[in-house]
Amino acid sequence: ALDTNYCFRNLEENCCVRPLYIDFRQDLGWKWVHEPKGYYANFCSGPCPYLRSADTTHSTVLGLYNTLNPEASASPCCVPQDLEPLTILYYVGRTPKVEQLSNMVVKSCKCS
Amino acid sequence: ALDTNYCFRNLEENCCVRPLYIDFRQDLGWKWVHEPKGYYANFCSGPCPYLRSADTTHSTVLGLYNTLNPEASASPCCVPQDLEPLTILYYVGRTPKVEQLSNMVVKSCKCS
């Protein structure tokens, strides 16, 4: 699986999850998030050669098409597969609010 | 929606579904598919600016991050959203077989 366990431990050029730390205030301008100050959102990148963690029949077909037609612009793209939520703390006035934001952290990738 | 109805009628630079005809024999080397000889598989391409058909909270966050940090390599990617099956005819010996291949035709795209 192209997950953090594999990708963070290997120098993988092809599609894999990469570490990306996002600071809410600095990188997004979100001053309203009190905690955490930032988090590892991660991202997916790298080429998708034929059959690499293909998401659908279409991505398999497109991967093969791209292999046999290297000049073609059409190829599968490395995108998030499994995502996890992030719990944040913010304030409405002086009242603390806790909210779980879904699909905030990429744990694995696929070729789609 | 970034679907064929919209994308095929507009000159859209950003993420959209694009027409792509694939000939089974010529483009994939699949001589075993008797009918059809080829089909419009289509593909997704184009930049994913902030908020453009964002698939998850993560892609929204990544889009904003990319907007505020243009030098960053992390950005959402334009990938298939809705796919349709394709029915094919092939032969096992002299016996014709009809099979529906799932997720073969891209009908719309999203930024993931």
Partner: antibody, heavy 117, light 102 residues
Framework: QVLLVQSGAEVRKPGASVKIFCKAS????????MNWLRQAPEQGLEWMGQ????????NYNGKFKGRLTLTADTSTNTAYMELSSLRSADTAMYYC??????????WGQGALVTVSS | AITMTQSPGSLAGSPGQQVTMNCRAS??????LAWYQQKPGQHPKLLIY???NLADGVPDRFSGSGSGTDFTLTISNLQAEDVASYYC?????????FGGGT
């Protein structure tokens, strides 16, 4: 590499004020929170407050309300901690520490403040 | 303010052994916890952040676990140089309080 260099030891009388500096280098000073902490002799650690040098935003430990002032000079990458109305219980080692990813990852060497009559 | 309670107050072990220490938060802090090691005359050194992640340059003999209110720091293959005070600290809303140390 990240480096936080603090000012030297200070001795003050009760009721006086003390101002300690913390000069940062090796990272983007304006875009990381700076925490201030202290540790009394043979005691545990206590978080005092934090400042975001980029816009001067601060969060204080209510225990020090009115006595603690945190500032930052972005032209010299220096953070300052001023504590007023000192009492003997304020005798401690004072630390600045960079906030990163739910921790304080880099610390200054500490500045000893002694409050004695 | 969130109260952090560490146990035990002190701990002894032999070289090569495994030891564990605990930290309990008075309310849910999710995974927003760090562990530090402090040797006499030195400033604290970050060991673990976000409850389970090993800080740069820290031997993998150290590991953190837990989420919510209960957390554990484990030192396996204990070494003489591990003699120190260990503190937990939460990062879930200011003030960021520390445990009393082990």
């Amino acid at each position: 590499q990240v480096l936080l260099v603090q000012s030297g030891a200070e001795v003050r009388k009760p009721g006086a004020s003390v101002k300690i500096f913390c000069k940062a280098s090796g990272y983007s000073f304006t875009s990381s929170w700076m925490n201030w902490l202290r540790q009394a002799p043979e005691q545990g650690l206590e978080w005092m407050g934090q400042i975001y040098p980029g816009d001067g935003d601060t969060n204080y430990n209510g225990k020090f309300k009115g006595r603690l002032t945190l500032t930052a000079d972005t032209s010299t990458n220096t953070a300052y901690m001023e504590l007023s109305s000192l009492r003997s219980a304020d005798t401690a080692m004072y630390y600045c520490a960079r906030h990163y990813d739910g921790s304080t990852d880099y610390w200054g060497q500490g500045a000893l403040v002694t409050v004695s009559s | 303010a969130i109260t952090m309670t560490q146990s035990p107050g002190s701990l002894a072990g032999s070289p090569g052994q495994q030891v564990t220490m605990n930290c309990r938060a008075s309310e849910n802090i999710y995974s927003n916890l760090a562990w530090y090691q402090q040797k006499p005359g030195q400033h604290p050194k970050l060991l673990i952040y976000a409850a389970t992640n090993l800080a740069d340059g820290v031997p993998d003999r150290f590991s953190g676990s837990g989420s919510g209110t209960d957390f554990t720091l484990t030192i396996s293959n204990l070494q003489a140089e591990d003699v120190a005070s260990y503190y937990c600290q939460h990062f879930w809303g200011t003030p960021y309080t520390f445990g009393g140390g082990t």
